[in-house]
Amino acid sequence: GDLLIQKTIKKQVVLEEGTIAFKNWVKTGTEVYRQFWIFDVQNPQEVMMNSSNIQVKQRGPYTYRVRFLAKENVTQDAEDNTVSFLQPNGAIFEPSLSVGTEADNFTVLNLAVAAASHIYQNQFVQMILNSLINKSKSSMFQVRTLRELLWGYRDPFLSLVPYPVTTTVGLFYPYNNTADGVYKVFNGKDNISKVAIIDTYKGKRNLSYWESHCDMINGTDAASFPPFVEKSQVLQFFSSDICRSIYAVFESDVNLKGIPVYRFVLPSKAFASPVENPDNYCFCTEKIISKNCTSYGVLDISKCKEGRPVYISLPHFLYASPDVSEPIDGLNPNEEEHRTYLDIEPITGFTLQFAKRLQVNLLVKPSEKIQVLKNLKRNYIVPILWLNETGTIGDEKANMFRSQVTGKIN
C-alpha cells in the first residue's frame, strides 16, 4: 500500500503537464494577500533638528491581492530535467480588507534623500545634493500617499539631478508589469528528491551579492518542497525579496482544514550575528553600522538594490539586537504576529498555508554637507513598512486534497 502511495505521489508531484503539482504550480489556486503596515513618523522635526528618537505609529493593514498571475515562458528542458519560468508581478488593492485607501497620507523618511546621501559619499557631491534638496524643497522626511510610497512617484529632488538617474522612487517600483526570474528549477522527472529545487536564478547559480556560501541559491522558492518531508529536515529556500537563501525548521504539528501539516518557522538563529551563528559571517558586509558584526536582526541588501541603503528585518525588529531598535519608539515585536512560517503537507511537500513577514528599512546617516541631515548625531535604520504575505488552501482544494492524498494514506 505504502509503495503504491509513494509511487502515485512521486508521479503527481513532478512538474510536468498533466500532474496535480504542475496545474497548481503554474497558477496558484490559493488566494494570496499582501498586507502592509506603514510606519507613520510622528515627530519629523524633532528628529531632524535634535536627532531625537524616531516615534512611529503603524497604520494598516492595507491589503493587496498578489501572485494571481500564471507563470510565464514555462519551458521544459528534457536534457537536464528542468523547467524554467518567469513569475509575473501584480498587485490589486482590496479596499474591503484595508483600513483606508491608497490615497492615505503618511509621513515617512525621504527615500531619495537617504539613498542619494548614501550612494554619493563624496563631500563635494554632497554639497551639490544639498543644493538640489533645498531647491526642490525636500527634507529628511516627506508626506506620501500609500500608492506613491509602494508603487512609485516622481521625486522632485532627483528630478533636478543633472546626471542621468531614475527620477521615479517607490519601495516596490517597478512592480506591476514586471516579472521575477528567470527561474530554472528541477522538474523531478529523474529524481523526485530534487523537485522544485532551484537550479539557476537569472541564469546563475550564485547571486553575486554575498561572499562564500551566503551567495548560494539554495532550495526551492518555498511554494513547495520535495515530497516526504521529515520533521528533522532543515528546509532551505530562496527569497528574491530579501536577496538571499534562508531556511526553516520544524516547530509543531498543525491541523489545517482536516489536513495534518508540519509548521516550519524561520528561527531566530537565521537572523543572529556571526558571534552567535558563525555561518552568518558572510551576511555581514560592513563593520560600522553592524558594530563590527555584533548587531543582528537586520540584513543590508544594498548590493541587491543598486547601492540604496535598504535593510531587511522582521517586523518591529523581531529578533534584532537592542541597538537597532533603540533609536525607534513605538515598536512592539511579538513572535505570533511577526515571524514567518510555512505549513507544509509532508507527503507531497506542498506549502498549504504560509505567512511571510518582513520589514523594509532604510539607513539614514548624518551628513555635514547636507543641511537636512546635518543635525543628526547617529545613524538610524528607519522602518518604513512591514508586510504580511499570506496564503491558505481554499476549502474546495482542501477537500480534494483530503480525499485524494491524506484520506488515502490514513
Epitope: N122, V125, N130, S131, N134, Q371, K374
Partner: antibody, heavy 116, light 107 residues
C-alpha cells in the same frame, strides 16, 4: 537668477587685515554652501575654504588656516572673508562661488593688492 | 594634497581645428573632475563636471573624458570665442585643487 556682487578692489599695507564681501541675490542664501577661491596672476586657482551659511560652519584648506576667516551675515545674504597679516603673497583676485551643480556661479572677483 | 598637472601651458590651434587639453592627477580621483573656462578679465565658468558631463548651455563641441588619473577636455571645431584659459579641478579629496591652466591661442 544667481547674482554675486563682490566688494571693490583693495590696496592695503603689509601686516594689515582686510575683509572682502560677497553679496548674494537671486537664490536662498542659506541653502547653498559658499566657496572662496584665490587666483594669482599666472598661478592658477587655489581653493581657500567653504562655509555653510545656514549655521556658519566653515572648512578651510590647511594652507589658509590662520590666514582666512569665513563668516556670513544671513540678514543681508552676504558672505565675508577676512584675510589677516597680509603680505605680497596675498595679492590676488579672490572669488566667491556658491555650490549649485558645482562651482557654477562665480562672483566677478575682488582684486587685493598688498603693497607698502 | 592631490596635484593636478596640466603639462601644456599653451596650446596653439586654428579656428575649425580639434584640440585636446590634458590633465593628470597625482592619485586616483575617479571621475570627480570638473573643467573651467576663463577669459581675460572674467571669472571662471564651468564646462564639464564628473569628468564627462557637459554643463547646461555649454556647446556640444566641448567634450570631457577620462577617469582615475588621466583626463582630457576636447574642443572640436574650435571657434574664436573658445580662445581662453582652461583649468581642471578635482573634487575627490579635500582640499579641492586646480590645475595650473592651459591657454588656448591662435597659431
Amino acid at each position: 537668477q544667481v547674482q554675486l556682487q563682490q566688494s571693490g578692489a583693495e590696496l592695503v599695507k603689509p601686516g594689515a587685515s582686510v575683509k572682502l564681501s560677497c553679496k548674494a541675490s537671486g537664490y536662498t542664501f542659506t541653502s547653498y554652501w559658499m566657496h572662496w577661491v584665490k587666483q594669482r596672476p599666472g598661478q592658477g586657482l587655489e581653493w581657500i575654504g567653504e562655509i555653510d551659511p545656514s549655521d556658519s560652519h566653515a572648512n578651510y584648506n590647511q594652507k589658509f588656516k590662520g590666514k582666512a576667516t569665513l563668516t556670513v551675515d544671513k540678514s543681508s545674504s552676504t558672505a565675508y572673508m577676512q584675510l589677516s597679516s597680509l603680505t605680497s603673497e596675498d595679492s590676488a583676485v579672490y572669488y566667491c562661488a556658491p555650490i549649485y551643480y558645482g562651482l557654477d556661479n562665480w562672483g566677478q572677483g575682488t582684486t587685493l593688492t598688498v603693497s607698502s | 594634497d592631490i596635484v593636478m598637472t596640466q603639462s601644456q601651458k599653451f596650446l596653439s590651434t586654428s579656428v575649425g581645428d580639434r584640440v585636446s587639453v590634458t590633465c593628470k592627477a597625482s592619485q586616483n580621483v575617479g571621475t570627480n573632475v570638473a573643467w573651467y573656462q576663463q577669459k581675460p578679465g572674467q571669472s571662471p565658468k564651468v564646462l564639464i563636471y564628473s569628468a564627462s558631463y557637459r554643463y547646461s548651455g555649454v556647446p556640444d563641441r566641448f567634450t570631457g573624458s577620462g577617469s582615475g588619473t588621466d583626463f582630457t577636455l576636447t574642443v572640436s571645431n574650435v571657434q574664436s570665442e573658445d580662445l581662453a584659459e582652461y583649468f581642471c579641478q578635482q573634487y575627490n579629496n579635500y582640499p579641492l585643487t586646480f590645475g595650473a591652466g592651459t591657454k588656448l591661442e591662435l597659431k
